[in-house]
Interface confidence: low
């Protein structure tokens, strides 16, 4: 459906309360180093433009598309560029490609400094002097430190920080109230952004039926009862919306997830029985509660998918009619079957039923060819439930702290290239897995740990891309979305690399050290690891306990000291020391 | 590029038949759903009736239930209708569309349209 006016059916469609905030992630997604201020005065004149639109759609400039109005006013911003350098250049360029041009500007990893938690008094201060300017100043700066960040769902989180501020900032004892709430938000926010980065990886680097696939794969675990038609149909309103929102078209985005949501609400007996308690909430938090909803049972007596799949003598015919759709139905059936699979394990079985079909359809006698193809799956599958099983058990006998550098080790043996903050935060998050999915029972291990992983694999690709350093990483990045994961399982130590020369400024630490957070004090140490592997790829697991063993008892006893400085002056060249002994 | 040729219509009296073809080309045929979507005179369009890319789902209006049949041939790359105890409100314009999907599954998004072809019911 057409409208005279995008900017006029956009505004009117969400209301001006999500238009605005759309509008102001948009920006601060697009342009991450703007200061605040700068922000909302573009997103205030945008919003006031709407409005004059609204009220005569043939007014002048009305008629201009979204990224046209947009990308004119981003380019109004004076310092432009002094502060983006060659991004300035795109404001050269005419539409579409000046906001392509934008998207490949978008930074993953801003420079930009950690965000500091004020006083929870300063916070509440602040939050009923002015509601609105505090709530735009946590969107704008959730967006520009997460530039892919899911917009509608951005809005989602703001409104829970909201209410978070609404009901402690009351409470006899609001620090207790409000930090356990700031902590989740955070912790959620973080992974709503990887799984978001994950899906617009996707979608960008693979395409559309890349991320079709895995759509289908998931949303047939979650709606086993609902028919192929009904999830296809999902699957491409899916697809749509979230082409958009990694395209920057925020507001349609959110426009499109709304519509999606009320025609799932309206469809709930042909789609899922879990769908209920969700269709009952508010549009933020219901388009939430449908992404996240349990699987559905699945239905009683399912066929044998031999029958349609392996037996019959159609296979052929049917596949060669209409491939994709064919392998979708595959794709189908199996997930609804499986949801103790992860949705990469079964697209890998797809990819391999559709390498035989390939193969044995052109052959001599097709169903003979094809007709173990069930067999070839047995290896795909043991994999990854060895993988889970064999790190589960690792986790349960180190702990979340020892497994993460169990995993520091291991990753940057495999690739010592990549630099040590990005082997830091991936290692440490990778090692989050154990505490995430190991405690779960067997029938959902797999699917929460492989899924989990591939999101966090896809951070580690993601900002490889920006300074690609290492061949192998780049391999398993682009040759395959859903073998990512296995491709750096079977990652080896690299015989090839020159060792880092030893750098005795690296491992000198001062008095500030007793004062980090215990978190802080961890990557401090894993930061140190990392390096002691760069420097002795070869060190073998007694000697890397051993120098962490001493590093450790080091720490302990400076930060005991009375003069703790003068303990670490001292203390620190023998540790030092004894470190290059111990790996010698 | 996409075409759609309607064929069929023509001057019929009301209780009789009439089937309409439509021969498609410039595209997959069978990757898509197609339908039938008609234009009485001076009246806005009424959708009759639409069959998934392997036609094993079938929807009708109601105005049409009972006395048309939509129906497919992929090899043929052809779309049917055939219309059985023709009335009076029947006269219309008939056009032959393409969906932008395999399904029928909730609002159908019309694509491509044919010229159309008239079928005028009266005694």
């Known amino acids: 459906d057409t409208h005279k006016s995008e900017v006029a059916h956009r505004f009117k469609d969400l209301g001006e309360e999500h238009f605005k905030g759309l509008v102001l992630v948009a920006f601060s997604q697009y342009l991450q180093q703007c200061p605040f201020e700068e922000h909302v005065k573009l997103v205030n004149e945008v919003t006031e433009f709407a409005k004059t639109c609204v009220a005569d759609e043939s007014a002048e400039n009305c008629d201009k598309s979204l990224h046209t109005l947009f990308g004119d006013k981003l380019c109004t911003v004076a310092t432009l560029r002094e502060t983006y350098g060659e991004m300035a250049d795109c404001c050269a360029k005419q539409e579409p490609e000046r906001n392509e041009c934008f998207l490949q500007h978008k930074d993953d990893n801003p420079n930009l400094p950690p965000l500091v938690r004020p006083e929870v008094d300063v916070m509440c201060t602040a939050f009923h002097d002015n509601e609105a300017t505090f709530l735009k100043k946590y969107l704008y700066e959730v967006a520009r430190r997460h530039p892919y960040f899911y917009a509608p769902e951005l809005l989602f989180f703001a409104a829970r920080y909201k209410a978070a501020f609404a009901e402690c900032c009351q409470a006899a004892d609001k620090a207790a109230c409000l930090l356990p709430k700031l902590d989740e938000l955070r912790d959620e926010g973080k992974a709503s952004s990887a799984k978001q980065r994950l899906k617009c990886a996707s979608l960008q680097k693979f395409g559309d039926r890349a991320f079709k696939a895995w759509a289908v794969a998931r949303l047939s675990q979650k709606f086993p009862k609902a028919e192929f038609a009904e999830v296809s149909k999902l699957v491409t309103d899916l697809t749509k919306v979230h082409t958009e929102c990694c395209h920057g078209d925020l507001l349609e985005c959110a426009d499109d997830r709304a519509d999606l949501a009320k025609y799932m609400c309206e469809n709930q007996d042909s789609i899922s029985s879990k769908l209920k308690e969700c269709c009952d909430k508010p549009l933020l938090e219901k388009s939430h509660c449908l992404a996240e909803v349990e699987n559905d049972e699945m239905p009683a007596d399912l066929p044998s998918l031999a029958a349609d799949y392996v037996e019959s003598k159609d296979v052929c015919k049917n596949y060669a009619e209409a491939k994709d759709v064919f392998l979708g139905m595959f794709l189908y059936e199996y997930a609804r079957r499986h949801p103790d699979y992860s949705v990469m394990l079964l697209l890998r079985l797809a990819k391999a039923y559709e390498a035989t079909l390939e193969k044995c359809c052109a052959a001599a006698d097709p169903h003979e060819c094809y007709a173990k193809v069930f067999d070839e799956f047995q290896p795909l599958v043991e994999e990854p439930q060895n993988l889970v099983k064999q790190n589960c058990e690792l986790f349960e006998q180190l702990g979340e702290y020892k497994f993460q550098n169990a995993l520091l080790v291991r990753y940057t043996k495999k690739v010592p290239q990549v630099s040590t903050p990005t082997l830091v935060e991936v290692s440490r998050n990778l090692g989050k897995v154990g505490a995430k999915c190991c405690k779960l029972p067997e029938a959902k291990r797999m699917p929460c740990a492989e899924d989990y992983l591939s999101v966090v694999l896809n951070r580690l690709c993601v900002l490889h891309e920006k300074t690609p350093v290492s061949e192998k990483v780049t391999k398993c990045c682009t040759e395959s979305l859903v073998n990512r994961r296995p491709c750096f399982s079977a990652l080896e130590l690299d015989e090839a690399y020159v060792p880092k020369a030893f750098n005795a400024e690296t491992f000198t630490f001062h008095a500030d050290m007793c004062t980090l957070s215990e978190k802080e004090k961890q990557v401090k140490k894993q930061t140190a690891l990392v390096e002691l592997v760069k420097h002795k790829p070869k060190a073998t697991k007694e000697q890397l306990k051993g120098v962490m063993d001493n590093f450790a008892a080091f720490v302990e006893k400076c930060c005991k000291a009375d003069d703790k400085e003068a303990c670490f002056a001292e203390e620190g060249p023998k540790f030092v020391a004894a470190s290059q002994a111990a790996l010698a | 590029e996409v075409q759609l040729v309607e064929s069929g219509g023509g001057l019929v009296q009301p209780g009789r038949s009439l089937r309409l073809s439509c021969a498609a080309s410039?595209?997959?045929?069978?990757?898509?759903?197609m339908h039938w979507v008609r234009q009485a005179p001076g009246k806005g369009l009424e959708w009759v009736s639409g069959?998934?890319?392997?036609?094993?789902?079938?929807t009708y209006a109601d105005s049409v239930k009972g006395r048309f049949t939509i129906s497919r041939d992929n090899a043929k790359n052809s779309l049917y209708l055939q219309m059985n105890s023709l009335r009076a409100e029947d006269t219309a314009l008939y056009y032959c569309?393409?969906?932008?999907?395999?399904?029928?599954?909730?609002?159908?998004?019309?694509?491509?349209w044919g010229r159309g072809t008239l079928v005028t019911v009266s005694s």
């Open positions: 569309v393409r969906d932008s999907s395999l399904f029928i599954v909730g609002a159908p998004t019309f694509e491509h």
């Open positions: 410039g595209f997959t045929f069978h990757h898509y759903a």
């Open positions: 069959i998934s890319w392997n036609g094993n789902k079938i």
